[in-house]
């Protein structure tokens, strides 16, 4: 079974590129990361930083998560991210996404030993 940490990496990490490569980035990535397998995941964020830098966020600014839990952390510095948002014309199984590149602080929920990201909460 896929661990929560491994799922986070699959769904949100893309250290191989420093930014979205094209306007088709999200369409390709959402499919290749199995985020359109059973349905079109409406929104997803990919982070273009090293795994070590993203894991380090778990010792940075402690903030409340959107769901009220308190094991979320905000990155001290901005990170290169790509937001993928489903378009109005998107219809499963032909999922379609708008690709938006940004530099923002990320907020992740952390758990476990080692203490690592298990959920992408927001970007600010």
């Amino acid at each position: 079974k896929e661990t929560a940490a491994a799922k986070f990496e699959r769904q949100h990490m893309d250290s191989s590129t420093s930014a979205a490569s094209s306007s088709n980035y999200c369409n390709q990535m959402m499919k290749s990361r199995n985020l359109t397998k059973d349905r079109c995941k409406p929104v997803n964020t990919f982070v273009h930083e090293s795994l070590a830098d993203v894991q380090a966020v778990c010792s940075q600014k402690n903030v409340a998560c959107k769901n009220g839990q308190t094991n979320c952390y905000q990155s001290y510095s901005t990170m290169s991210i790509t937001d993928c948002r489903e378009t109005g014309s998107s219809k499963y199984p032909n999922c379609a996404y708008k690709t938006t590149q940004a530099n923002k602080h990320i907020i992740v929920a952390c758990e476990g030993n080692p203490y690592v990201p298990v959920h992408f909460d927001a970007s600010v």
Partner: nanobody
Framework: QVQLVESGGGLVQAGGSLRLSCAAS????????MGWFRQAPGKEREGVAA????????LYADSVKGRFTISRDKGKNTVYLQMDSLKPEDTATYYC???????????????WGQGTQVTVSS
């Protein structure tokens, strides 16, 4: 580097009291929740008590309710555990933890102290 340093452990007779203290250094912000966990020899680590930074949210394990009191310096990364009416079964290493959730699940806490030993003799 964040460090949590506990103090106040020791040997006490059953029915006695101890006060544990924990302070976090090297962290520029305020942890929302800080708490105490304990681990007795051969047993799993268990949650004892936790409290939020405003002092409004507290949680206790059933085994310590009415005997232990957790407190914090408001808005600061310090936490205390007043332990009264101690029992031999309270004997354990007590760990301070920070940055976790309010459910007293150790998986949600990211920062840990080295632990302080509490021994309750009968």
């Amino acid at each position: 580097q964040v460090q949590l340093v506990e103090s106040g452990g020791g040997l006490v007779q059953a029915g006695g009291s101890l006060r544990l203290s924990c302070a976090a250094s090297g962290y520029a912000y305020t942890y929302i929740y800080m708490g105490w966990f304990r681990q007795a020899p051969g047993k799993e680590r268990e949650g004892v008590a936790a409290m939020d930074s405003g002092g409004g949210g507290t949680l206790y394990a059933d085994s310590v309710k009415g005997r232990f009191t957790i407190s914090r310096d408001k808005g600061k990364n310090t936490v205390y555990l007043q332990m009264d009416s101690l029992k031999p079964e309270d004997t354990a290493t007590y760990y301070c933890a920070a940055g976790g959730g309010y459910e007293l699940r150790d998986r949600t806490y990211g920062q840990w102290g080295q632990g302080t030993q509490v021994t309750v003799s009968s």
